[in-house]
Interface confidence: low
Amino acid sequence: SGEIALCKTGFPEDVYSAVLSKDVHEGQPLLNVKFSNCNGKRKVQYESSEPADFKVDEDGMVYAVRSFPLSSEHAKFLIYAQDKETQEKWQVAVKLSLKPTLTEESVKESAEVEEIVFPRQFSKHSGHLQRQKR
């Protein structure tokens, strides 16, 4: 998979974004940055610019390495993909932002609001929050 009409080898987009709750937990899947391995022949390994906080598995799923409260300090980092044979390297920016919190007042106003504001993350069309199938 890749850019517009053409699966150019690399990341399908220049920037990936995820909206998260304030508290990020160790092992929590955050988003997917699947590399566009167009012809299927490339063996790519991923690397995070902030390895103490984020790791990437072989499917391009980004996980939290530890538990921490999300802050501007963690809001932007890079993911690198490197071709194991040619050593070609690509990078993509990841932006994390906080999910808006509900005030007590708005919760009182609508008992259903939590259902609306906090849908399940892994729905069919949740884009990068979907695990790749083999």
């Epitope: 998979s1 850019e3 517009i4 009409a5 053409l6 699966c7 167009c38």
Partner: antibody, heavy 115, light 106 residues
């Protein structure tokens, strides 16, 4: 060689829907995104969205959200784009596009919306 | 929506001359992509990731730039380069195109 073959020209009335198909051959269909773009007569290019057949995920241009649906049938390596509630300004040439570097595009499908 | 503005709208040059096409983004983008489209044909990718030449594209084409200002250069124009050229960004959905620069060869 890689080929993307689109369905034929369509003439539709305002308010109707149109479905354009795009059959891929010469590569592994699930290895690529399939994008849909359009170009109104004498105008520039407009990106409508894409489908990732590998994980069945779509991303749409907000302008078309609610009117466009992109699907794929991996068993026959075919992608589909359906646009509903057609208006006269939807008259355009529609392209599917995918591929690796070489930049593969379908041959285009003209959709005319006219009462 | 991120807006890409191309200039000039039309460029008329002679074979052998150098063509410089500009694309300005309304806010910063990471990369720019350039396409060539001839009448009645689908677009063709020329440049990806700002400066990488797509396979099969002659090396008289080159791309440069960063941030909000990007350039497509054709070093020595050939008659077959007459076409409309579009820039496109993938940094911010929707993935918008510029309005195009029509290149005429005298």
């Amino acid at each position: 060689q890689v080929q993307l073959v689109q369905s034929g020209a369509e003439v539709k009335k305002p308010g109707a829907s149109v479905q354009v198909s795009c059959k891929a051959s010469g590569y592994t269909f699930t290895s690529y995104l399939m994008h849909w773009l359009r170009q109104a007569p004498g105008q520039g290019l407009e990106w409508m969205g894409y489908i990732n057949p590998y994980i069945d995920v779509t991303k749409y241009n907000e302008k078309f959200k609610g009117r466009v649906t992109m699907t794929s049938d991996t068993s026959i390596s075919t992608a589909y784009m359906e646009l509903s509630s057609l208006r006269s300004d939807d008259t355009a040439v529609y392209y599917c596009a995918g591929g690796d570097y070489e930049d593969y595009w379908g041959q285009a499908t003209l959709v005319t919306v006219s009462s | 929506e991120l807006v890409l503005t191309q200039s000039p709208g039309t460029l008329s040059l002679s074979p052998g001359e150098r063509a410089t096409l500009s694309c300005r983004a309304s806010s910063s983008v990471n990369y720019m992509y350039w396409y060539q489209q001839k009448p009645g044909q689908a677009p063709r990718l020329l440049i990806y990731y700002t400066s990488n030449l797509a396979p099969g594209i002659p090396d008289r084409f080159s791309g440069s730039g960063s941030g909000t200002d990007f350039t497509l250069t054709i070093s020595s124009l050939q008659p077959e380069d007459a076409a409309t050229y579009y820039c496109q960004q993938f940094s911010s959905p929707p993935f918008t195109f510029g309005q195009g620069t029509k290149l005429e060869i005298k």
